[in-house]
Structure formats: structure tokens, C-alpha cells
């Protein structure tokens, strides 16, 4: 008799994939053309993504340091108006991508909950909600709650609203900590609330520091559901040393939580990078054209378009790394293990019942090494083959799909492998 | 047998270039790294630079700017090159293999002996 | 970079005789990646003792490496005249790589 089937867990749409943060509609669309209509126009390229929900704003009403300017149930005529927001809710969920409102009071400020004015602004924030939740969204973010006083009361009766809505709809909390024990009693309170951090970011980025931020992170957290990313708002490129970029992508996308992403960091966008560029809000590279004040100053393997037609590219890598996490059951919800392996290296396991496993090593160093992967550290439920079959290599040169032995297995500087073998009974 | 073998031009004259092939046999540039280290007479070993199996190479930021390592995979060889050559370049100049065990140098070449001099 | 001091820069020993020689850091070095080389007069160097206390293929077991953070050594229980030769270590830690000066031994 085959052995019984491990039951599924339950899945809320945010399990099954990654999101992306667009914090600045008018950089994400390039120049002088930032509204909700054009970006109903670039959901065929959010799709192709493979993203599962996009975190959006603030588009409210704002004006600078000012409670009484700000105006939460209204959209600044900037981004456009509400029927846009309705049309652009109508089309991403024809498309299957989630909404997500950001709902950062002081976006515009210097202190982005009115530190003076918090009860205020928590009452509209409350209202806000109601309002936004009957209009379709499918969640809500607030960033920065390290300034906003009690905010895990805040939160829970927050996250109340947005649950006792629907269990579908999903509370996002933002903080530039990136201490292990403020993002726990953050977490404490709300039992459904994603959190984003610069928790991976405060790292000397080797593979035994980020196995042993990861490790303690998953345990601290105990069986809750995680979100990965490096900061609650900002770009990959302005946290990681550019050889680190590919690794990180093929990390974020395998440990088990949501991966959450800035809009760029799927090309390797850099926070000014061209002249005259904000800091906080760089243009998207859409192509050639999309910086015109300086000819030349954008070349093609910088943007989307180019990178599109590139299958090394870091954006091909993204793509398919995205795929393979919204389909595969072992990476949707599966079990993790890591295992020791040579120095500067972290390797895990995510594996779930009968399903096809995936292996993932990644080489933080900028030294060639063998994987010296030790199995012995694995529960029986996850050992390792002899051989296992590459996905990819974050790294041009070697042959998807090739089987490769796993005792003579041996990494690039800054490699990342990930290899799928088949459960055995 | 795995074996590493030196050629270089052993005269070079100052402010002129270098150019070393490393001609590797027994194993494949694919999978190792190769280094590169001189020494000059009487003198300690200096490291140069490696070039990985996959191409990355990285060089000692004290010659970077004079130095260059390729390969060609299929004749399995690693080709050092340095320019503006001065009299304490002189040295015997080694290539060694990179097994990926831990940034060691598992096997060395004879050395092909380089003097500076007009 | 990380510098590595070798001590004694010399030395001469009695066969049978005991000998120690140390390498020295100016910062941190992982055991996985300080190694120990032989080279004889007028030859190439040879891989001796890897990630501390490995030693290479055919060397003889008389040999053994220690240490870890700064602090890193090489020891022959009982000396041959066949050991007459300098011994260099090396480290990784970040490039560049750095070798030692080396400690000759010389055999009375």
C-alpha cells in the first residue's frame, strides 16, 4: 500500500508567491507619466513576473507634515482618481495579482505617523480601512511602526478590521529595525500580520552569518508564516555588494515565507545610479529611453527590455525563480532543513511529503569551494541522493537540467545552485 | 598525471609587457581554479591573482592595474599577462591549482624564471 | 591585507629533535583556510598541510598542524633530514591571499 498523503496546509493567496513594492508610481513608470491608469497598462509585465500581489503606494492625500492636509479616503489627483483605482482593482484581479494599499500616513514627511498626533492618525487610519476594504483592496501596509507609539495595540485592532473583513485580506507592517527581539513582540501580537525588516540587511554577508540570521529568525518566529526581504521599502542594490544580487534573489524565492520585492529589484536597479536621480525613488529602466535627459547614460542590459531577451540575465533569473515557487509544492509550503557545508557556503532543504525536493546551495564567498555538503545533519525524512538535477545556477555555464553528483559538487565565488530530486520511500 | 607547466619568455626588457602560458594536463580548466605566484630570488612567495572555473577572475590590488588573466578552455591553458615591467618584477613565476577544498594550492608548476633587465 | 609573520625565520634541529614553528595573523583567520607549503631548494613549493591540520597526500605522519583566530603552528614530532626545507603558510580571508616569510629549517 503506497503511504498516505501529507495533508495540505491551508493557503492564503500571499503563500503561494512573491510581492512587489511599487512605493513611487511616477519612477516606476518612468518620466512624467506616473498615474493609476498607466499602470493598469504595465500589469501584462507584473504578470509575467509571476507576482502574486502588489504593495502600492501611498496614493492618499498628503501634504507635508500637515494632520489635517491628509486625507486617507482620498487619492491625490496626482496618481489620479478613485474610478482609476477601481479600474485598475477590476483589471489586476482579471489578472489574478492582489492590491495591497499602503497607507503611510506622512509619506510626504519627515515623521511618518505625526508622532504629536498618533491617536488621530490612528482613528483615521481605522476609518481608512473600512473604507478601502469595501472599495476591493486586498490588503493593507504601514511602514515605519518603530515611531508609532503602541504600535502593537495599533496593529492587532488593524489587523481585527482587516481580518474580520475576510481572512483573505492581508495586513502588512513595515520597520526599519532590524533587532530580532522588536520584530518578535511586533509579531507576538498578531498572529497574521506579514512583517518586512532590515533584519537580513544588518549582516556581514558570509553563509554562516546569514545561515545563523535565518535559523534564529525561524525559530524566534516559531511556525508562523514569514515574509523575506532586506528592508521594509528600499532596493535590493542599495543593501548587497552587486555579486551578492543573483544569490539573494535565489534565497529570498526558497526560504519558506513570501518573498517580498522592490520594483527594480528584478533588473538590478540601483538607487541613484544616473545623475539627478532621487535617492529614494529611482526611475524604472524600462528601456533605452527611459532616462532622455543623458543620451548613453542607460545601457540596453540595464533595463527590462534588455534584459528580456537576455536568458542570463538577472531578471531571466528572477522570472524563472518565480515560477518555480508559485508551482512547486516543496517550495510553496514546504519543510526546511540546513545542513553544514563547506565554509562561506549555506545550504537547506525544503521538501513536502511525496513531492519532488529542492536543494539549495549558495556560496556567499568570492572564493571557488566544494560544497562539502554533510547530510548527516538532516532528519531521515530529508536526506540527500547521490545526484541530484540542476534548476539553475545563478551563474552562466552549466547545463540546466544536468544531473549532478552531489559529493563532488563544487561552487563558483558568489554561486548559487538550486537542484531538484524526486522523493524516495 | 595532474601536472601545471610554465612558459614565459625568461627575458624581458623594462617598462615592457609579459605575457606567461600556464599549460595545464590531467584535470580540466572547467572544474579548478588556477592561481598564479611568483617569488622572487631569495626572497618569499606573492600571490598574483586566480582565475576560477567559471571565468571570474581576482587579482592582487597592488598589481591589479598591471595585471590580466584569461583561459582557453579547450587547450587547457591559463594565460598570464603584466605590463610595465620593472627590474623587482624579476622573480621565478608559478602557476598552482585551486581544488575548491579551501582556497589552497594543491598542485604547482616547475616555474618559468623572469628577469627584468636591459 | 592579512599579514602573516613567521616565526623563527630560521632554525636548525637534531634529527629525532622536536620542532614548532609558528605563523602569526594580524587578523582573524579561519582554520578551513590556513595552509602550510614545503619548498625545497631550487623546487617548486608542495602543499603540505591544509585547513590547519590536514596533511596532503604522502606526507609523512610526523607532521601536524594546529591553531585557530591569529595563532596557527607546525609541528615534527621527530625530525628527518629529508625536512630540511623552508615552510611557508598561507591564508585566505578575503584577497588577496598571503603567504608567510617563511621559516627555514636547516638539519644538524
Known amino acids: 500500500r503506497a503511504p498516505r498523503c501529507r495533508e495540505l496546509p491551508a493557503q492564503k493567496w500571499w503563500h503561494t508567491g512573491a510581492l512587489y513594492r511599487i512605493g513611487d508610481l511616477q519612477a516606476f513608470q518612468g518620466h512624467g507619466s506616473g498615474n493609476l491608469a498607466g499602470l493598469k497598462g504595465r500589469l501584462d509585465y507584473l504578470s509575467s513576473l509571476k507576482v502574486k500581489g502588489l504593495v502600492l503606494g501611498p496614493l492618499h492625500k498628503n501634504q507635508k507634515d500637515d494632520v489635517a492636509q491628509t486625507d486617507l479616503l482620498q487619492i491625490d489627483p496626482n496618481f489620479g482618481s478613485k474610478e482609476d483605482f477601481d479600474n485598475l482593482l477590476q483589471s489586476a484581479k482579471k489578472k489574478s495579482i492582489r492590491v495591497i494599499l499602503d497607507l503611510t500616513p506622512n509619506y510626504r514627511g519627515e515623521n511618518l505617523w505625526f508622532s504629536t498626533q498618533v491617536d488621530s492618525v490612528a482613528t483615521k487610519v481605522k476609518d481608512a480601512l473600512e473604507f478601502w476594504l469595501q472599495a476591493g483592496v486586498d490588503g493593507f501596509q504601514v511602514r515605519d511602526i518603530e515611531n508609532l507609539k503602541d504600535a502593537s495595540s495599533f496593529l492587532a485592532e488593524w489587523e481585527n478590521i482587516t481580518k474580520g473583513f475576510s481572512e483573505d485580506r492581508l495586513l502588512i507592517a513595515g520597520t526599519n529595525s532590524s533587532d530580532l527581539q522588536q520584530i518578535v513582540s511586533l509579531l507576538e501580537s498578531n498572529k497574521d500580520l506579514l512583517l518586512t525588516s532590515s533584519y537580513l540587511s544588518d549582516s556581514s554577508f558570509t553563509g554562516e552569518h546569514t545561515k545563523s540570521l535565518v535559523t534564529q529568525y525561524l525559530n524566534a518566529t516559531g511556525n508562523r508564516w514569514c515574509s523575506w526581504s532586506l528592508s521594509q521599502a528600499g532596493l535590493l542594490t542599495s543593501f548587497l555588494p552587486a555579486q551578492l544580487l543573483r544569490l539573494y534573489q535565489l534565497m529570498l524565492f526558497t526560504l519558506p515565507g513570501t518573498p517580498v520585492f522592490s520594483y527594480g529589484d528584478e533588473i538590478g536597479l540601483k538607487a541613484a545610479a544616473l545623475p539627478g536621480q532621487p535617492v529614494e525613488a529611482p526611475v524604472m529602466l524600462w528601456d533605452e529611453s527611459s532616462f532622455p535627459d543623458i543620451p548613453g547614460a542607460v545601457s540596453a542590459n540595464m533595463t527590462v527590455k534588455g534584459q528580456s531577451e537576455d536568458p542570463g540575465s538577472l531578471l531571466s533569473l528572477f522570472r524563472q525563480l518565480s515560477d518555480q515557487r508559485s508551482k512547486e509544492r516543496s517550495l510553496l509550503h514546504g519543510d526546511f532543513h540546513t545542513f553544514s557545508s563547506g565554509p562561506g557556503l549555506f545550504s537547506y532543504i525544503r521538501h513536502w511529503d511525496q513531492n519532488e525536493r529542492f536543494l539549495v546551495v549558495l556560496n556567499f564567498g568570492d572564493v571557488g569551494l566544494s560544497a562539502g555538503l554533510q547530510a548527516s545533519d538532516l532528519p531521515a525524512s530529508a536526506s540527500l541522493p547521490t545526484k541530484a538535477d540542476l534548476v539553475l545556477s545563478t551563474q552562466p555555464g552549466r547545463e540546466e537540467g544536468s544531473p549532478l553528483e552531489l559529493e563532488r559538487l563544487k561552487l563558483e565565488p558568489h554561486e548559487g545552485l538550486l537542484l531538484r530530486f524526486p522523493y524516495v520511500a | 598525471q595532474v601536472q601545471l607547466k610554465e612558459s614565459g619568455p625568461g627575458l624581458v626588457a623594462p617598462s615592457q609587457s609579459l605575457s606567461i602560458t600556464c599549460t595545464v594536463s590531467?584535470?580540466?580548466?572547467?572544474?579548478?581554479?588556477v592561481h598564479w605566484v611568483r617569488q622572487p630570488p631569495g626572497k618569499g612567495l606573492e600571490w598574483l591573482g586566480v582565475i576560477w572555473a567559471g571565468g571570474s577572475t581576482y587579482y592582487n590590488s597592488a598589481l591589479m592595474s598591471r595585471l590580466s588573466i584569461s583561459k582557453d578552455n579547450a587547450k587547457s591553458q591559463v594565460l598570464l599577462k603584466m605590463s610595465s615591467l620593472q627590474t623587482d618584477d624579476t622573480a621565478m613565476y608559478y602557476c598552482a591549482r585551486d581544488n575548491y577544498g579551501g582556497v589552497y594550492l594543491d598542485v604547482w608548476g616547475a616555474g618559468t624564471t623572469v628577469t627584468v633587465s636591459s | 591585507e592579512n599579514v602573516l609573520t613567521q616565526s623563527p625565520a630560521s632554525m636548525s634541529a637534531s634529527p629525532g629533535e622536536k620542532v614548532t614553528m609558528t605563523c602569526r595573523a594580524s587578523?582573524?583567520?579561519?582554520?578551513?583556510?590556513l595552509h602550510w607549503y614545503q619548498q625545497k631548494s631550487g623546487a617548486s613549493p608542495k602543499l603540505w598541510i591544509y585547513?590547519?591540520?590536514n596533511l596532503a597526500s604522502g606526507v609523512p605522519a610526523r607532521f601536524s598542524g594546529s591553531g585557530s583566530g591569529t595563532s596557527y603552528s607546525l609541528t615534527i614530532s621527530s625530525v628527518e633530514a629529508e625536512d630540511a626545507a623552508t615552510y611557508y603558510c598561507?591564508?585566505?580571508?578575503?584577497?588577496?591571499?598571503?603567504f608567510g616569510s617563511g621559516t627555514k629549517l636547516e638539519i644538524k
Open positions: 590531467g584535470f580540466s580548466l572547467t572544474s579548478y581554479g
Open positions: 585547513s590547519t591540520s
Open positions: 598561507q591564508q585566505y580571508s578575503g584577497y588577496p591571499l598571503t
Open positions: 587578523s582573524s583567520v579561519s582554520s578551513s583556510y
